[in-house]
């Protein structure tokens, strides 16, 4: 087909000789054809079309990529001749850097539905050259990691040695989609979530007297996990006193948040303090009530069949621990004013007497 009608874009890939890195070309079809063919999508007027014309709509065709030999030979089908170049929907992925990737790459829709569609193509002139080692010692890597749950940033490798003030305007893409919220050489992430991982592309324009080039770099971003540096955090009980009714059953819940640990051995127990005595209570098993990639909330309840007068003099302590340290929360029971009658009080005292006998014969105290 005649490529003279294709729109042209010039790109520069300055690769680091010290690292493995990838490169991506987008089939960035021109605006005039987008309305006719290249972007005949189901977007409503309020939706902003994606940077890539074909990725979203299933009935839009994929594209065909070609490489134009410098000697004027016929166009070559990328898939047949270049195993290190992968065609992925509307992108072309170069798995290995090298000056041999320099050349002209053409993309056009696979399906041509009308005479107008013939000109719906893009020619990308790619220049590939090694980055001078002297340019910057601490340039950002093409593989960057973000720690889950923390703050972080993604830096454009080709601009990471420049201050934000010096930096030209940058266009960012994530997994092929335009990120419109930042034009800086760094994307700042307030809290890292798993969805921040992906393939990021940063573009900026470099001009000389003769022409203008888009300098592009690709960054693979992973979200990673690391052991918490914090002790567990007791979410409940919040209050140190709890109003109760004598003679009635009572459940006190202890809920604690444990930060991520690769080897996770959480400890959660209830114990009771009574004067100078202290003992652990056998209570139902702890259960995980919420688990995310960065933390886990665990709950364990203490159950009193009937609240007694003695319970009012005791302190109930929830103890939680991880490999960093422990946290405790004490709860003192307080009788609800105006609750219960004489019968309740006699009943409670009878229970207390039975419990004293049972308590003295069964519990092993430790100080």
């Amino acid at each position: 087909f005649n490529i003279s009608g294709c729109s042209t874009k010039k790109l520069l890939w300055a690769y680091s000789t010290r690292s493995e890195e990838e490169f991506i070309l987008f089939c960035d079809l021109p605006e005039p054809q987008k309305s006719h063919f290249c972007h005949r999508s189901q977007l409503s007027p309020t939706q902003v079309p994606d940077h890539l014309p074909f990725t979203d709509s299933k009935d839009l065709p994929d594209v065909q990529w070609y490489r134009q030999p410098s000697n004027g030979d016929p166009l070559e089908d990328i898939r047949k001749s270049y195993p290190h170049i992968i065609q992925d929907k509307c992108t072309l992925r170069f798995l290995t850097p090298g000056v041999n990737n320099t050349g002209s790459y053409i993309c056009r829709p696979k399906m041509i539905k009308s005479p107008y569609d013939v000109a719906c193509c893009v020619k990308m002139i790619l220049e590939v050259k090694p980055q001078s080692n002297a340019s910057c010692e601490n340039s950002a890597s093409h593989k960057q990691d973000l720690l889950l749950g923390s703050t972080g940033s993604i830096s454009c490798p080709s601009l990471s040695c420049q201050s934000d003030a010096q930096s030209p305007e940058v266009t960012w893409y994530k997994n092929g989609k335009l990120l419109s919220m930042t034009r800086s050489n760094r994307i700042v992430v307030d809290e890292v979530y798993i969805y921040h991982q992906g393939t990021y592309v940063c573009d900026y324009t470099q001009s000389d007297t003769a022409s203008s080039w888009t300098v592009r770099a690709v960054v693979q971003v992973r979200t990673i996990v690391g052991d918490t540096k914090l002790k567990p955090d007791i979410l409940d009980p919040v209050e140190s006193t709890l109003e109760v009714e004598l003679g009635k059953p009572l459940t006190i819940s202890c809920k604690a948040r444990f930060g991520f640990e690769r080897v996770f051995n959480p400890v959660m127990k209830w114990y009771i303090k009574d004067a100078d005595l202290e003992w652990e209570v056998s209570v139902p098993e702890a259960k995980s009530i919420k688990s995310t990639l960065k933390d886990e909330i665990i709950e364990r309840n203490i159950i009193l069949e009937k609240v007694t007068q003695r319970d009012l003099r005791r302190t109930f302590v929830c103890f939680v621990q991880n490999s960093i340290g422990n946290t405790t929360q004490s709860v003192q029971l307080k009788e609800k004013r105006g609750s219960g009658g004489l019968n309740d009080i006699f009943e409670a005292q009878k229970i207390e007497w039975h419990e004293t006998v049972r308590f003295q014969s069964h519990h092993h105290h430790h100080h």
């Epitope: 992973r222 979200t223 990673i224 690391g226 052991d227 690769r262």
Partner: antibody, heavy 124, light 107 residues
């Protein structure tokens, strides 16, 4: 690009303590786990243990009584000490960055960057 | 400790061949498996994590599959640089363990 370099004596006498250091360059020691792995001549790989940059450790039970791994974040280094060595501890010792990748709603650990290895011979 | 058994222990193949290496765990390890390539005198190089996720920069001719106890590493079309020893590794429980390795040689 992160690079790891092992250093330490290549020859250790039986019953003595083997000491190796791994220096991390081109990146931070923070936020990662750091492992030691060894490979006896002509054999497979054996994991010795890891340390998180904050100091949490986890050791292979078969070596636990003899192993200590420590970290010095100010120097971007972590170290291995293996006491009471015998000829069976002769191996190539590797240090590696051990990363927990959060993906597909789970965690996947992998040793993604390795040192080139250092040969340690235990002999009198 | 979880034992990983690789088969075959060694394998001869030609450039362009499709090769499959298997790794069997002594108990279920979900998808907590990684694959490494090691060349003589060199450190292992990581290829695949989570049983099937390819590390960026690793050629797409490498692929991993499996879950539970049975896993495979496939090289769709062998290249000269692929001749090496391959190890599987489990991270499901401690201690972390490796398979005994599969040596891939040129026929």
């Amino acid at each position: 690009q992160v690079q790891l370099q092992e250093s330490g004596p290549g020859l250790v006498k039986p019953s003595e303590t083997l000491s190796l250091t791994c220096t991390v360059s081109g990146g931070s020691i923070n936020n990662y786990y750091w492992s030691w792995i060894r490979q006896p001549p002509g054999k497979g790989l054996e994991w010795i243990g890891y340390i998180f940059y904050s100091g949490t450790t986890n050791y292979n039970p078969s070596l636990k009584s003899r192993v200590t791994i420590s970290v010095d974040t100010s120097k971007n280094q972590f170290s291995l000490k293996l006491s009471s060595v015998t000829a069976a501890d002769t191996a190539v010792y590797y240090c590696a960055r051990d990363v927990g990748i959060a993906a597909r709603n789970s965690y996947y650990y992998v040793m993604d960057v390795w040192g080139q290895g250092t040969t340690v011979t235990v002999s009198s | 400790a979880i034992q990983l058994t690789q088969s075959p222990s060694s394998l001869s193949a030609s450039v362009g061949d499709r090769v499959t290496i298997t790794c069997r765990a002594s108990q279920g390890i979900s998808s907590a498996l990684a694959w490494y390539q090691q060349k003589p005198g060199k450190a292992p190089k990581f290829l695949i994590y989570g049983a099937s996720s390819l590390e960026s920069g690793v050629p797409s001719r490498f692929s991993g599959s499996g879950s539970g106890t049975d896993f495979t590493l496939t090289i769709s079309s062998l290249q000269p640089e692929d001749f090496a020893t391959y190890y599987c590794q489990q991270f499901n429980s401690y201690p972390i363990t490796f398979g005994q390795g599969t040596r891939l040689e040129i026929k």
